[in-house]
Amino acid sequence: GSERTCCPVNWVEHERSCYWFSRSGKAWADADNYCRLEDAHLVVVTSWEEQKFVQHHIGPVNTWMGLHDQNGPWKWVDGTDYETGFKNWRPEQPDDWYGHGLGGGEDCAHFTDDGRWNDDVCQRPYRWVCETELDKASQEPPLL
């Protein structure tokens, strides 16, 4: 069948999801597409427990998540409702700051060095986390 009982090589299983943590950086859209080519999505944080898990694995490094407001309202990439869902913004965030001088505001969310969230310029090359649910991935492990 198409369901799997374990995560691909180099992915970490947690609470029926598989997570992959990058060690290099890409712009948010490129990170999003990378995850999509893995039949996954940028990580969607739905609980304090999941927040702690991800934070433990990424350490104190700016890291993209699957949350953005590029089309107006804040949206999770998998359709999880933002308004009623888990949030962990830094104080005063998100602020859509225009003072960075790079043009436009800040439309993409990332984990900061203390794990709390900030909105930032989507073109910044931050690390990223991919997530896929176990019952969505193919059964065969990759060769590598």
Partner: antibody
Framework: EVQLLESGGGLVQPGGSLRLSCAAS????????MNWVRQAPGKGLEWVSV????????FYADSVKGRFTISRDNSKNTLYLQMNSLRAEDTAVYYC??????????????WGQGTMVTVSS | DIQMTQSPSSLSASVGDRVTITCRAS??????LNWYQQKPGKAPKLLIY???SLQNGVPSRFSGSGSGTDFTLTISSLQPEDFATYYC??????????FGPGTKVDIN
């Protein structure tokens, strides 16, 4: 031996259609995103399209968007490229290539031998 | 889109020569740079990925270096089978992986 084998190329008139196939053997096809890359005669390489391992996500170069459709049948270990509204500038050798993803870096590690598509009246 | 340029566009060399090909990106691509070799009538072959990682089965005379926007492919001692065209490719902008125009290495 890990192998990709393209077929379906040929001569077609402008505005016509063609369907390319790429048969994979000796590797876990469904675990890999697959690409089409083309090379016009005497020219360089141009990425055309990619599809994720389970076929859920697809992407296209602007030059073919709306005209070409990438798909795959994992039960047959086969990748496809449906090419419609063909133009003279689509004339090229078309290669299928698998996506290597290591530590966040990506490359095309396995290539087919290519199939020639000629668009001419 | 990220543009890739290569220099030289062609070069003549002899067996045993040390050959260096450079590749430049129009913006920083970190270490997301691959090198391919292509012989006439054949498919490209991956030599190096992520700037400096040698693909399985590729001879150690091939090496890659660089970061940001400037990258280099070096062949330490050119062999007869190395006469070919070499392409760099950026893999920063997933999935729009643009290639350089190529560098043809032929016999002096």
């Amino acid at each position: 031996e890990v192998q990709l084998l393209e077929s379906g190329g040929g001569l077609v008139q402008p505005g016509g259609s063609l369907r390319l196939s790429c048969a994979a053997s000796e590797f876990t096809f469904s675990s890999y995103a697959m690409n089409w890359v083309r090379q016009a005669p005497g020219k360089g390489l141009e990425w055309v399209s990619v599809i994720s391992g389970r076929g859920i996500n697809t992407f296209y170069a602007d030059s073919v968007k709306g005209r070409f459709t990438i798909s795959r049948d994992n039960s047959k270990n086969t990748l496809y490229l449906q090419m419609n509204s063909l133009r003279a500038e689509d004339t090229a050798v078309y290669y299928c290539a698998s996506r290597l993803a290591v530590a966040g870096s990506e490359a095309f590690d396995i290539w087919g031998q290519g199939t020639m598509v000629t668009v001419s009246s | 889109d990220i543009q890739m340029t290569q220099s030289p566009s062609s070069l003549s060399a002899s067996v045993g020569d040390r050959v260096t090909i450079t590749c430049r990106a129009s913006q920083s691509i970190n270490n997301y740079l691959n090198w391919y070799q292509q012989k006439p009538g054949k498919a490209p072959k991956l030599l190096i990925y992520a700037t400096s990682s040698l693909q399985n089965g590729v001879p150690s005379r091939f090496s890659g270096s660089g970061s940001g926007t400037d990258f280099t492919l070096t062949i330490s001692s050119l062999q007869p089978e190395d006469f070919a065209t070499y392409y760099c490719q950026q893999s920063y902008s997933t999935p729009l992986f643009t290639f350089g125009p190529g560098t043809k290495v032929d016999i002096n």
